[in-house]
Amino acid sequence: TLNSVLINSNAIKNLPPPLGGAGGQPGSAVSVAPGVLYEGGNKYQTLDNYQPYPCAEDEECGSDEYCSSPSRGAAGVGGVQICLACRKRRKRCMRHAMCCPGNYCKNGICMPSDHSHFPRGEIEESIIENLGNDHNAAAGDGYPRRTTLTSKIYHTKGQEGSVCLRSSDCAAGLCCARHFWSKICKPVLKEGQVCTKHKRKGSHGLEIFQRCYCGEGLACRIQKDHHQASNSSRLHTCQRH
């Protein structure tokens, strides 16, 4: 379980890397509570006839995707970025958008967003991950360093139809998906419901009625009894794994 790994962090997420490393005193390791088991994601998406959809930022991708280079690491080849399948629970991440809906990037690991831990108005202990140089430390060495900041966080979850930015803004059972030119909370798809599997992503970024992803334990697959002449128009539904 994830209890077997101790996590340290010392970076404010989405900040550029430090120049010459960070300094500070070694931070204490934080044990992370175990989460629910999940399906692992692959290095590349493996849809039939999959054509990568180029992107510049996460918002151009689907709610269960993020924008990054498909090559190893984050460097990329020639700076080309495409929409990649989101990272499941307990996978390595570098920012929140990499994690699948219902998860967030905590100390480099996609963790479930268990909002029961944060009731409305509760004081939350937030870790500020510090990259500042500390001249008392060994010069140039980077050490995990943590500073605690107390802040008041209000967690109000968007109901169906509420405007949202990402799925974590929506209540349980909802995801944040495009509707016309904004994004609203829509229901996560149930077994048997029609889903969208993008074989050609050319119009994906301009999809104005975006469906949610399939719910837990379901995958978007071609409906077995749905045979049509055109491959591109075959119906996909949410089916049990």
Epitope: L37, G40, G41, N42, R72, A75, R92, M94, N107, G108
Partner: antibody, heavy 119, light 107 residues
Framework: QVQLVQSGAEVKKPGASVKVSCKAS????????ISWVRQATGLGLEWMGW????????GYAQNFQGRVTMTWNTSISTVYMELSSLRSEDTAVYYC????????????WGRGTTVTVSS | DIQMTQSPSSLSASVGDRVTITCQAS??????LNWYQQKPGKAPKLLIY???NLETGVPSRFSGSGSGTDFTFTISSLQPEDIATYYC?????????FGQGTRLEIK
């Protein structure tokens, strides 16, 4: 070319600490995790943990709880693994490996640093 | 922790033989599995990632398959330079764990 160069062999007494370095070249150092894996003579591979020099994230396997510290120096593209309170069973070859954080494949390895713990 | 069990622990085969190594996970790990080759006195080398994808520059005689808990690594036609120990590694859950290794020898 893409490579990880590790520091030389070490002989330590029980209770002491050892600090192994791993210098990266030929790739963007901050775009990958660096994992540390050890291998005792004639035995299998044991993952110790990772660190990401860009974010500073580190994760340690619980077997090494409280004994391992992974640090880095971005300016010289080097990561360090320090293991304290050494015991005889820590005698092993310690490898650093470039690790993709998408599929956690360790595709570039250092040659290994032999650490011998003996009184 | 997820336990990875490889079998056999060692095997002897002739040049040109088809060689198969299996790896079993103690729980479902989807396709989150890599295979490595380690020659004596050397560092491991990544051969297969995501259970079945061949790493760049690795000869096509190496292949991998499987998902869930049961995985197979195959060398379609054994070559003298394939003498090594082979390890599977799961990355579905932390900590990362390796199989105990399979030592391959030439008959």
């Amino acid at each position: 070319q893409v490579q990880l160069v590790q520091s030389g062999a070490e002989v330590k007494k029980p209770g002491a600490s050892v600090k192994v370095s791993c210098k990266a070249s030929g790739f963007t150092f901050t775009s990958y995790d660096i994992s540390w894996v050890r291998q005792a003579t004639g035995l299998g591979l044991e993952w110790m943990g990772w660190m990401n020099p860009s974010s500073g994230y580190t994760g340690y396997a619980q077997n090494f709880q409280g004994r391992v510290t992974m640090t880095w120096n971005t300016s010289i593209s080097t990561v360090y693994m320090e293991l304290s309170s050494l015991r005889s069973e820590d005698t092993a070859v310690y490898y650093c490996a470039r690790t993709d954080y998408y599929y956690y494949g360790m595709d570039v390895w250092g040659r290994g640093t032999t650490v011998t713990v003996s009184s | 922790d997820i336990q990875m069990t490889q079998s056999p622990s060692s095997l002897s085969a002739s040049v040109g033989d088809r060689v198969t190594i299996t790896c079993q996970a103690s729980q479902d790990i989807s396709k989150d599995l890599n295979w490595y080759q380690q020659k004596p006195g050397k560092a491991p080398k990544l051969l297969i990632y995501d259970a079945s994808n061949l790493e760049t520059g690795v000869p096509s005689r190496f292949s991998g398959s499987g998902s869930g808990t049961d995985f197979t690594f195959t060398i379609s036609s054994l070559q003298p330079e394939d003498i090594a120990t082979y390890y599977c590694q799961q990355y579905d859950d932390l900590p990362i764990t390796f199989g105990q290794g399979t030592r391959l020898e030439i008959k």
